[in-house]
Amino acid sequence: IWELKKDVYVVELDWYPDAPGEMVVLTCDTPEEDGITWTLDQSSEVLGSGKTLTIQVKEFGDAGQYTCHKGGEVLSHSLLLLHKKEDGIWSTDILKDQKEPKNKTFLRCEAKNYSGRFTCWWLTTISTDLTFSVKSSRGSSDPQGVTCGAATLSAERVRGDNKEYEYSVECQEDSACPAAEESLPIEVMVDAVHKLKYENYTSSFFIRDIIKPDPPKNLQLKPLKNSRQVEVSWEYPDTWSTPHSYFSLTFCVQVQGKSKREKKDRVFTDKTSATVICRKNASISVRAQDRYYSSSWSEWASVPCS
Amino acid sequence: RAVPGGSSPAWTQCQQLSQKLCTLAWSAHPLVGHMDLREEGDEETTNDVPHIQCGDGCDPQGLRDNSQFCLQRIHQGLIFYEKLLGSDIFTGEPSLLPDSPVGQLHASLLGLSQLLQPEGHHWETQQIPSLSPSQPWQRLLLRFKILRSLQAFVAVAARVFAHGAATLSP
């Protein structure tokens, strides 16, 4: 058993049918010695008396808010949560496996630049009695500070028969060094509590590996005289790191016909313009990627040819 | 070239070669099935490789003030990786394919390090840790780790030379 926060404790259980569970001793936080009784949750049934209460915690019915009283007055509370270990592996009931980029990916994170700011998100089908707490650091043995905000519900979508809820959090490395080569990964730890179930999820990454630039901005077409060709131009997204002579992007320009089956023409360039042939009813799209490190491409910025 | 006395390197040449290094490093080790190398044990890891750190002056301001600190750091790293790529980690079993980019990568690391330091002038170089994995699978894992680490290193070096070519060339 360990303390999650003041008066909230996590009991770790080896979870299998007929498991013996864990013996837990609760102590009433009071100078009083006599006339103390214990109850669980809203029940008025007295579970025991005395300054300490010894219980055998086996299942969720044994978890909850234990309260010690004296003469009708509440003295203190202890909330017991359960953390299930199933055959040596901590349970992952609360969050959905996003399966991208690999199985057992519960947390996904992205950064728009090298400033040390990043966003993480996760999915669940649970709509109520759910709380999250997020901590982060650079490295784990001698951790350097990363400050995370509160996790918020960022999207809801219907998937088949049930609803899916997306939560996200923004974090910022306290002393980021955008130009340095990272040697210690960022660690992100999410505590999830659903009713009386506790779970924790972690992710470890380098900012360089989660970079995904915003799409190029101000995408424009300039027809070239007496030609089917057009000059496409664009600019670096505002959110990308500066100076651009140091934090350079490379670009992919694509001409795509109306039908998805039509052949796509693609051009790669380090410049912020390119000359392409504009077909009728086609659209021109441009996306960006770090020039020197193959992290994710941005989403496409698009304009119609006409 | 970064000659004794601290004159400027051939920024544009360095830029071209460092960008080529980035391409080679990624073709030598693309993201193989998203193998998470940080999860793959640290018993024979590449933690001892030289990293371009915050105080090494490789940021735009540091380069403007005095690029020599940064160039020395990059040179150290180039020599370090050049030696690693020439070691039995890469020459031993399992043999690299004949058309593997590792050979080109090795030669380009040497080429860029020579651009930065002509003969007769010596910056101190970092000692290579004695990494001699016994099993072929350990060697394979170490190759992946070294190449992933090299990708990060040459990305920073390429940024330095791109910025230098754009802003510090005479």
Epitope: D14, W15, P17, E59, G88, D93 | E40
Partner: antibody
């Protein structure tokens, strides 16, 4: 004491269907994940499928994906395996078992796929 | 196709010590715990070892398990006639859990 009893096995022709049941008693069935494991005659153990305690997630071996469906009815304390498009290579003893460090197995039910 | 490899058979005289190996990789045994089962002819598997080296109550202390790196082993000391059975190791893969990975199985024969 935990008890698992499989039923529903038998002889079936290739391409046909069969539904296996596993009746659980002696524990809070709705709190635990459950597996189906099979063993072809004279062969080793092969995992078939898993279902979470609440039925929210199901996992299958590649060899049965798209043909077999695992389900559970927690109100009846029963686990099911719906087997469609049966093949000769599905011939085996099918066991249900609880998920956890200390597991409990049923006695098994024999499924024979033969023309 | 099992990814946990065991020897097809091992044998020993009564009273002897035999060991069964179970070889996996970093993503399965290297990252997860190992169980061992005993299966007597015509019966369901019986748990012998869990969490690499723990014995459930009722299992004789002649059976012991260990794990090192990407391999695990089961040792039977003071071999007895009733130990003649098939033995299976089981683990999980880091990326496919909760799918069970079983070893190929080992037939233990008690000689004489």
């Amino acid at each position: 004491q935990v008890q698992l009893v499989e039923s529903g096995g038998g002889v079936v022709q290739p391409g046909r269907s069969l539904r296996l049941s596993c009746a659980a008693s002696g524990f809070t069935f709705s709190s635990y994940g459950m597996h189906w494991v099979r063993q072809a005659p004279g062969k080793g153990l092969e995992w078939v499928a898993f279902i979470r305690y609440d039925g929210s997630n199901k996992y299958y071996a590649d060899s049965v994906k798209g043909r077999f469906t695992i389900s559970r009815d927690n109100s009846k304390n029963t686990l099911y395996l719906q087997m469609n498009s049966l093949r000769a290579e599905d011939t085996a003893v099918y066991y249900c078992k609880t998920h956890g460090s200390h597991d409990n197995w049923g006695q098994g039910t024999m499924v024979t796929v033969s023309s | 196709q099992s990814v946990l490899t065991q020897p097809p058979s091992v044998s020993g005289a009564p009273g002897q010590r035999v060991t069964i190996s179970c070889s996996g990789s970093r993503s399965n045994i290297g990252s997860n715990t190992v169980k061992w089962y005993q299966q007597l002819p015509g019966t369901a598997p019986k748990l012998l070892i869990y969490y690499n080296d723990q014995r459930p109550s009722g299992v004789p202390d002649r059976f012991s398990g260990s794990k090192s790196g990407t391999s695990a082993s089961l040792a039977i000391t003071g071999l007895q006639a009733e130990d003649e059975a098939d033995y299976y190791c089981q683990s999980y893969d880091r990326y496919t859990h909760p799918a069970l990975l079983f070893g190929t199985g080992t037939k233990v024969t008690v000689l004489g």
